[in-house]
């Protein structure tokens, strides 16, 4: 059965450059290993932001990536991207791969448009 990946269409990053959004897939397969990849689309280019493999025991992911974090619960991943600046505004896609046990499945969300506004610099005070 095909898997559907859903994610919010728009998210506004905080003033500290942090954006959080869920990535869910359905139906909920009985999967021991799920690989989640966050991709950024700019024009026709697609680049990997971060990727991790979640398991029943390893529900905290992206440990190798300083700007990404995420937690996995059943068929929902809560993603957080930090260190964002205005130039990072763009469409962020969630790709889900059901790795184990077989069969392998892949699904892609439609993307979350993350808007990042750089904070105004504090005025100098005498």
């Amino acid at each position: 059965e095909a898997i559907q990946v859903t994610q919010p269409s728009v998210v506004l990053a905080s003033s500290h450059g942090v954006a959080s959004f869920p990535c869910e897939y359905s139906p909920s397969h009985n999967t021991d290993e799920v690989r989640v990849t966050v991709l950024r689309q700019t024009n026709d280019q697609m680049t990997e932001v971060c990727a991790t493999t979640f398991t029943e025991k390893n529900t905290v992911g992206f440990l190798d990536y300083p700007f990404c974090s995420g937690t996995f619960n059943e068929s929902r991943v809560n993603l957080t991207i930090q260190g964002l600046r205005a130039v990072d505004t763009g469409l962020y896609l969630c790709k889900v791969e059901l790795m184990y046990p077989p069969p392998y499945f892949v699904g892609m969300g439609n993307g979350t448009q993350i808007y990042v506004i750089d904070p105004e610099p504090c005025p100098d005070s005498d």
Epitope: L39, E48, V106
Partner: antibody, heavy 123, light 107 residues
Framework: QVQLVESGGGVVQPGRSLRLSCAAS????????MHWVRQAPGKGLEWVAV????????YYADSVKGRFTISRDDSKNTLYLQMSSLRAEDTAVYYC????????????????WGQGTLVTVSS | DIQMTQSPSSLSASVGDRVTITCRAS??????LNWYQQKPGKAPKLLIY???SLQSGVPSRFSGSGSGTDFTLTISSLQPEDFATYYC?????????FGPGTKVDIK
């Protein structure tokens, strides 16, 4: 240039075993997933198995599951297909094919193929 | 398993003709579809991946389109070297099944 050369085919009796090899050159073998695809005489293509670039995942067609094992030796730049309990319906040309292990939006595809090795299962 | 069907199973065409081959998946596979060309006694050759991306070195007369369950391979102006059998393949879910093939021969 990319080269894939299969070997190990031949005539084998039903129920026996055979190991196919695929020697790779012209690219960084350890960076690519690898597939086996077969083609029975006069028939279409049948996907057999895939192994991920790092060997972490292996997937098989239902028709060979439990009888065939895909493996790789990155130190020798070689892909293997261990075939056991062979049946007449396993008679085919077996191709190995290279696949980019990570394709962002494109899924997995075989971009280079060997010329194949013929396996005939007959008593 | 996802089943792939192709139509027509064979077709006769002349050099210069526009040729269209269709491939249908038994369930939605998004854009995870590849097209291959095979000539007798030769290994298959990748033409199109991800439904519409042209493989490097493949002539621009080949194009692919479609998403979901219905896909098309188009040869805009058939050349003598294009007479071959064409296969679609899904890479959405294992097993990565192929279609039965479409044989293009000379009218």
């Amino acid at each position: 240039q990319v080269q894939l050369v299969e070997s190990g085919g031949g005539v084998v009796q039903p129920g026996r075993s055979l190991r196919l090899s695929c020697a790779a050159s012209g690219f960084t073998f350890s960076s690519y997933g690898m597939h086996w695809v077969r083609q029975a005489p006069g028939k279409g293509l049948e996907w057999v198995a895939v192994i991920w670039y790092d060997g972490s995942y292996k997937y098989y067609a239902d028709s060979v599951k439990g009888r065939f094992t895909i493996s790789r030796d990155d130190s020798k730049n070689t892909l293997y297909l261990q075939m056991s309990s062979l049946r007449a319906e396993d008679t085919a040309v077996y191709y190995c094919a290279r696949a980019p292990h990570y394709a962002i939006l494109t899924g997995y595809y075989e971009d280079y193929w060997g010329q194949g090795t013929l396996v005939t299962v007959s008593s | 398993d996802i089943q792939m069907t192709q139509s027509p199973s064979s077709l006769s065409a002349s050099v210069g003709d526009r040729v269209t081959i269709t491939c249908r998946a038994s369930q939605s596979i998004s854009s995870y579809l590849n097209w291959y060309q095979q000539k007798p006694g030769k290994a298959p050759k990748l033409l199109i991946y991800a439904a519409s991306s042209l493989q490097s070195g493949v002539p621009s007369r080949f194009s692919g389109s479609g998403s979901g369950t219905d896909f098309t391979l188009t040869i805009s102006s058939l050349q003598p070297e294009d007479f071959a059998t064409y296969y679609c393949q899904q890479s959405y879910s294992t097993p990565f099944t192929f279609g039965p093939g479409t044989k293009v021969d000379i009218k």
